[in-house]
């Protein structure tokens, strides 16, 4: 149960998580215009990975995409790889976690592969997760460098005479929901990680023990398996389904209403 | 067919108060952000204030500003200035203007005249 | 508040001869954004409300002849007209749309000569 829920709740943890960073990605608002300390302007700036668009006062937004590869910093390079790998990996891991759900019945598969599935999701979050906090990072890391610079230079001009206001930008809306989605989708790869342990089959070795009941005897073999007749004590708060004595988080029938999170 | 009608101006006392009123038709009044810009008999054109489209940003004239409130009801497709102790300085004719690309004025009202005299 | 200077402050034109006005602004009102100057050009006839000729200091509004064009960069602004036209008679006034108040020029008589 107790598996279910934390493999269940890492999985719609890592879903928001994901939906977050794709978001983030395509948001326009990754700097926006500094407006403290500055001349209130009738023009408002904000800058994506993808464009650059200028709001007016008059209500009017113009986007331009950067239709330039070479162009661009190398940073920004960098912060568009990392998002797009994480959203990649965050994909193919939700993908894999769909199959790994141990809500979810697929024909005859083994609880060993359920396990290696979740672990599998549950690292590709965590990288996926790591990816956008270190691209949101850079980013951030990037605004905080050309903002101070600019601040130095603020004001340049020709003779004194002319002033030119230089346009300083900071940490836009897009930044924090990265922050946030990419904390989310590691946290979710944690939690499928952690449901992953739950999920795989003990190999305790336990003796074979024979039980002797008036000519009737019931042979419980090391792994958990009933092997012949339809009773026998039900030891270390086991449930009987389908002919199959094991624990319950490793019962894989059909679930009941418990078995949701 | 875009129209801006302006109306309430009149002669008013010093220290005294005045609602201009601009009604809008022929586009999409609630898009837009909106002005009120005044002329002083014999001078040149000066900005009073501006409203945005979503009602969230007001700007005004230094000369203005705490004297004059602008406003809109999108309902009524109307632009308001409430003018309070107005003075002598106030006399002018006032334009409402609607914004367009480049926050230009890119259509004007026909204008009402504001007397401010004892 | 940004400053907007024009000059000439009257013009005598006569008719089918080119004008040119000039304005310039305190500050610089290139938008480093979209590379756009947010300088308006309005002329105001006698007896009339102004009217928009050219936003982004040089985009001419629709329904303007194209004997009227701006150009100018950051501060320095100017209006041509190439051949002045009976109509082009007024009062034209340059405006400051970047920074907050949106200040007007002192305004250019364009007169018949």
């Known amino acids: 149960m107790a598996v279910t829920a934390c493999q269940g709740l890492g999985f719609v943890v890592s879903l928001i998580g994901i939906a977050g960073i794709i978001a983030a990605t395509c948001m326009d608002q990754w700097s926006t215009q500094d407006l403290y300390n500055n001349p209130v302007t009738a023009v408002f700036n904000y800058q994506g990975l993808w464009r650059s668009c200028v709001r007016e006062s008059s209500g009017f937004t113009e986007c331009r995409g950067y239709f330039t590869l070479l162009g661009l910093p190398a940073m920004l390079q960098a912060v568009r790889a990392l998002m797009i790998v994480g959203i990649v990996l965050g994909a193919i891991g939700l993908l894999v976690s769909i199959f790994a759900l141990k809500c979810i019945r697929i024909g005859s598969m083994e609880d060993s592969a359920k396990a290696n599935m979740t672990l599998t999701s549950g690292i590709m979050f965590i990288v996926s997760g790591l990816c956008a906090i270190a691209g949101v990072s850079v980013f951030a890391n990037m605004l905080v460098t050309n903002f101070w610079m600019s601040t130095a230079n603020m004001y340049t001009g020709m003779g004194g005479m002319v002033q030119t206001v230089q346009t300083r930008y900071t940490f836009g809306a897009a930044l924090f929901v990265g922050w946030v989605a990419g904390g989310l989708t590691l946290i979710g790869g944690v939690m499928m990680c952690i449901a992953c342990r739950g999920l795989a089959p003990e190999e305790t070795n336990y003796k074979a023990v024979s039980y002797h009941a008036s000519g009737h005897s019931v042979a419980y073999k090391p792994g958990g398996f009933k092997a012949s007749t339809g009773f026998g004590s039900n030891t270390k708060n086991k449930k009987i389904y389908d002919g199959g004595a094991r624990t319950e988080d490793e019962v894989q029938s059909y679930p009941s209403k418990h078995d949701y999170v | 067919e875009v129209q801006l009608v302006e109306s309430g101006g009149g002669l008013v006392k010093p220290g005294g108060s005045l609602r201009l009123s601009c009604a809008a038709s022929?586009?999409?009044?609630?898009?837009?952000?909106m002005s009120w810009v005044r002329q002083a008999p014999g001078k040149g054109l000066e900005w009073v204030s501006t409203?945005?489209?979503?009602?969230?940003?007001?700007y005004y004239a230094d000369s203005v500003k705490g004297r004059f409130t602008i406003s809109r009801d999108n309902a009524k497709n109307s632009l308001y200035l409430q003018m309070n102790s107005l003075r002598a300085e106030d006399t002018a004719v006032y334009y409402c203007a609607r914004q367009g690309y480049g926050n230009a004025l890119d259509y004007w009202g026909q204008g009402t005249l504001v007397t401010v005299s004892s | 508040d940004i400053v907007m200077t024009q000059t000439p402050l009257s013009l005598p034109v006569t008719p089918g001869e080119p004008a040119s006005i000039s304005c310039k602004s305190s500050q610089s009102l290139l938008n480093s954004g979209n590379q756009k100057n947010y300088l308006t050009w309005y002329l105001q006839k006698p007896g009339q409300s102004p009217q928009l000729l050219i936003y982004?200091?040089?985009t001419r509004e629709s329904g303007v002849p194209d004997r009227f064009s701006g150009s100018g960069s950051g501060t320095d602004f100017t209006l041509k007209i190439s051949r002045v036209e009976a109509e082009d008679f007024g009062v034209y006034y340059c405006?400051?749309?970047?920074?907050?108040?949106?200040?007007f020029g002192g305004g250019t008589k364009v007169e018949i000569k």
């Open positions: 405006q400051n749309d970047y920074y907050y108040p949106l200040t």
């Open positions: 982004w200091s040089s």
């Open positions: 409203i945005s489209s979503g009602d969230s940003y007001t």
């Open positions: 022929g586009f999409s009044f609630s898009n837009s952000a």
